[in-house]
């Protein structure tokens, strides 16, 4: 699995999307987990409703929410009030009994709020030991662009 990078601004919300084949994963609950180290386990943060039919209902664990469009095949995770410690490697998972299939590997990067004039050194990225040369960047900054600002260029 390649790693997809989602960037969000500290203090704001970040929405992560994980597309999947809806028929392949029919009937399977989904989960969002945080990777503990490069080869460590993936610690469950939040999972969809216990009843698969109700997967569209948003479930929260602290500031993290999950909802699943089981027909369209898109799992959406919302990280509210993004904080420096939220930066890191995560996975979207499809659950089947005790099995967990990885739908997408996600690297969350937390950017300093440009409107926040605190210490300019407050940029939060995962440790340099992690290599994501093939990572695909999804810019998911949730605030509206200010007049005159240039939005991030689209990525392929």
């Amino acid at each position: 699995h390649n790693t997809t990078v989602f960037q969000g601004v500290a203090g704001q919300s970040l929405q992560v999307s994980c597309p999947y084949d809806s028929m392949k994963h029919w009937g399977r609950r989904k989960a969002w987990c945080r990777q503990l180290g490069e080869k460590g386990p993936c610690q469950r943060v939040v999972s969809t409703h216990n009843l698969w039919l109700l997967s569209f209902l948003r479930r929260w664990n602290g500031s993290t929410a999950i909802t699943d469009d089981t027909l369209g095949g898109t799992l959406t995770i919302t990280l509210r009030n993004l904080q420096p410690h939220d930066a890191g490697l995560y996975q979207c998972q499809s659950l089947h009994g005790s099995e967990a299939d990885t739908l997408r590997k996600v690297l969350v990067e937390v950017l300093a709020d440009p409107l926040d004039h605190r210490d300019a050194g407050d940029l939060w990225f995962p440790g340099e030991s992690e290599s994501f040369e093939d990572a695909h960047v999804e810019h998911s900054i949730s605030r509206s662009l200010l007049e005159g600002e240039i939005p991030f260029p689209p990525t392929s």
Epitope: M23, K24, G27, G97, S98, E99
Partner: antibody
């Protein structure tokens, strides 16, 4: 109507390989997992593995890892199971079956092929 | 892997009697269970899915019940065409193992 048509009986020598086929019709081939099941004479059903033709993702029970290889050809809506290093205990009827789904998200094998008999003999 | 223990292995019954076959899973399978009937020399046929739901065309004398680790298939007023083999199968993660089967024969 949904149909799974399996290939004809096989007679093989010990140590040889055979490739069984299961041709699907009457539904969207790439959207349903296909299961393979073994049944030795006078014995019960034994689950071998499953493949999702949409992307070729295959899962096997531990016993059949290395023994069975599942593949799928989208262009012909056909799933294949190759059995290698054949031995007498591989003599059995092999079934393919579609993994049906329900609106509530449950699975069951709703359509079965007629079975292919494999006899391993020197 | 989840083990499915099916009982009895065989039973002899008369037409019109009621039969109950049970299946025990080695862990909770959350009703992800199917029952099949197989006649000699034929492919299995789906009877029950999701533990309690009858497949299309299955007579109402068949019924499935259970939850957690314990499941059963009941056949009321057994008919001559009901004789054969019955298997349970779980779908709570691969491998989708079967029970050992139950042979229902005429007394």
């Amino acid at each position: 109507q949904v149909q799974l048509q399996q290939s004809g009986a096989e007679l093989a020598r010990p140590g040889a390989s055979v490739k069984l086929s299961c041709k699907a019709s009457g539904y969207t081939f790439t959207s349903y997992w296909i299961q393979w099941v073994k049944q030795r004479p006078g014995q019960g059903l034994e689950w071998i593995g499953t493949i999702y033709p949409g992307d070729g993702d295959a899962r096997y029970t531990q016993k059949f890892k290395g023994k069975a290889t599942l593949t799928a050809d989208k262009s012909s809506s056909t799933t294949y199971m190759q059995l290698n290093s054949l031995a007498s205990e591989d003599s059995a009827v092999y079934y393919c079956a579609r993994n049906g789904i329900t609106t509530a998200g449950y699975y069951a094998m709703d359509y079965w092929g007629q079975g292919t008999s494999v006899t391993v003999s020197s | 892997d989840i083990q499915m223990t099916q009982s009895p292995a065989s039973l002899s019954v008369s037409v019109g009697e009621t039969v109950t076959i049970t299946c025990r899973a080695s862990e909770n399978i959350y009703s992800n269970l199917a029952w099949y009937q197989q006649k000699q020399g034929r492919s299995p046929q789906l009877l029950v899915y999701a533990a309690t739901n009858l497949a299309d065309g299955v007579p109402s004398r068949f019924s499935g019940s259970g939850s957690g680790t314990q499941y059963s298939l009941k056949i009321n007023s057994l008919q001559s065409e009901d004789f054969g083999y019955y298997y349970c199968q779980h779908f709570w993660g691969t491998p989708y193992t079967f029970g050992g089967g139950t042979k229902v024969e005429i007394k």
